[in-house]
């Protein structure tokens, strides 16, 4: 039985040109996390494998950085980065847990202040 829950950063608006950290946290389960995939609109951005470490998709290498932790840092944001991001936790023996974060990238005049900085 899958008892775990995923907590996320929550939906975020951020400034064009800035950077943002997307984070998920799996709780309420003793299952072992074997891999975390980060995806956007059916595109794989990055993988963090418990044994092999991080792999960033080649097409995102310039603008995606691993971490902190199992999170993902998106840099040099453009309005085209607006969309839904998925953290997909592969666990044993539970199976797969998915968290969802919607990011809206805005011109600086309407973005929330502080969105370019790291999560406290």
């Amino acid at each position: 039985m899958m008892t775990g829950t995923i907590e996320t950063t929550g939906n975020i608006s951020a400034e064009k040109g800035g950077s943002i950290i997307l984070q998920c946290h799996l709780s309420s389960t003793t299952a072992q996390v074997t891999q975390v995939n980060w995806e956007q609109q059916d595109q794989l951005l990055a993988i963090c494998n418990a044994d092999l470490g991080w792999h960033i998709s080649p097409s995102f290498k310039d603008r995606v950085a691993p971490g902190p932790g199992l999170g993902l840092t998106l840099q040099s944001l453009t309005v085209n980065d607006t969309g839904e991001y998925f953290c997909i936790y592969h666990t044993y023996p539970d199976g797969t847990y998915t968290g969802r974060i919607f990011l809206e990238v805005l011109e600086s005049s309407v973005a929330e202040h502080g969105a370019r900085f790291q999560i406290p």
Partner: antibody
Framework: EVQLQQSGPELVKPGASMKISCKAS????????MNWVKQSHGKNLEWIGL????????SYNQKFEGKATLTVDKSSSTAYMELLSLTSEDSAVYYC????????????WGQGTSVTVSS | DVVVTQTPLSLPVSFGDQVSISCRSS???????????LSWFLHKPGQSPQLIMY???NRFSGVPDRFSGSGSGTDFTLKISTIKPEDLGMYYC?????????FGGGTKLEIK
């Protein structure tokens, strides 16, 4: 003046599919997210999902994945929602609603499209 | 999904009354940057829903200042200081912090 003009009421048979349109005017269509909302039984509101006109992205309430398909036509400033394999549970009023930048809410709403599923 | 609960379900009022509508969420609506995405709508019969308040306490353009929004975390309130006839209808809160966005069940503001 921002306006969202939706297509007219529909009476459709169970198992059929249909498409609702939402034509935007009075603002730059590609600058704003478009949301879709279902109102059943004259009361409950449910967020179906959204489309992102400037990059073609979508986000769905998982409850409506496989039921609703959201698309946009930038050339005509029109958003569409196709409803698939209709059943009586899909009888409702459907609204399109423009997103407010940076606040994850809706500011302007269409007039609603009534969909009745009946044989 | 985040469950949003509104109370009361029905609120009988007299014109001139001050009223409060409560909205509670099953988890905090504060995102990692301290932003809270909670909005309020009024839905009058035969009309489309209309935005009243967004970001907890920002009044939408054209909304009179007798409307005010407050709250934090999981507990939010919409106050109307002096009820007028045009204020009657169904009030809904909406959380947009977590996917999917979810509405409260509604509060019907009606005349006594």
């Amino acid at each position: 003046e921002v306006q969202l003009q939706q297509s007219g009421p529909e009476l459709v048979k169970p198992g059929a599919s249909m498409k609702i349109s939402c034509k935007a005017s009075g603002y730059s269509f590609t600058d704003y997210i478009m949301n879709w909302v279902k109102q059943s039984h004259g009361k409950n509101l449910e967020w179906i999902g959204l489309s992102i006109p400037y990059n073609g992205g979508t986000s769905y309430n998982q409850k409506f994945e496989g039921k609703a398909t959201l698309t946009v036509d930038k050339s005509s400033s029109t958003a569409y929602m196709e409803l698939l394999s209709l059943t009586s549970e899909d009888s409702a009023v459907y609204y399109c609603a423009r997103g407010i930048k940076g606040y994850f809410a809706m500011d302007y709403w269409g007039q609603g499209t009534s969909v009745t599923v009946s044989s | 999904d985040v469950v949003v609960t509104q109370t009361p379900l029905s609120l009988p009022v007299s014109f001139g009354d001050q009223v409060s509508i409560s909205c509670r969420s099953s988890q905090s609506l504060v995102n990692s940057f301290g932003k809270t995405y909670l909005s309020w709508f009024l839905h009058k019969p035969g009309q489309s829903p209309q935005l009243i308040m967004y970001g907890v306490s920002n009044r939408f353009s054209g909304v009179p200042d007798r409307f005010s929004g407050s709250g934090s975390g999981t507990d939010f309130t919409l106050k109307i200081s002096t009820i007028k006839p045009e204020d009657l209808g169904m009030y809904y809160c909406l959380q947009g912090t977590h996917q999917p966005w979810t509405f409260g069940g509604g509060t019907k503001l009606e005349i006594k």
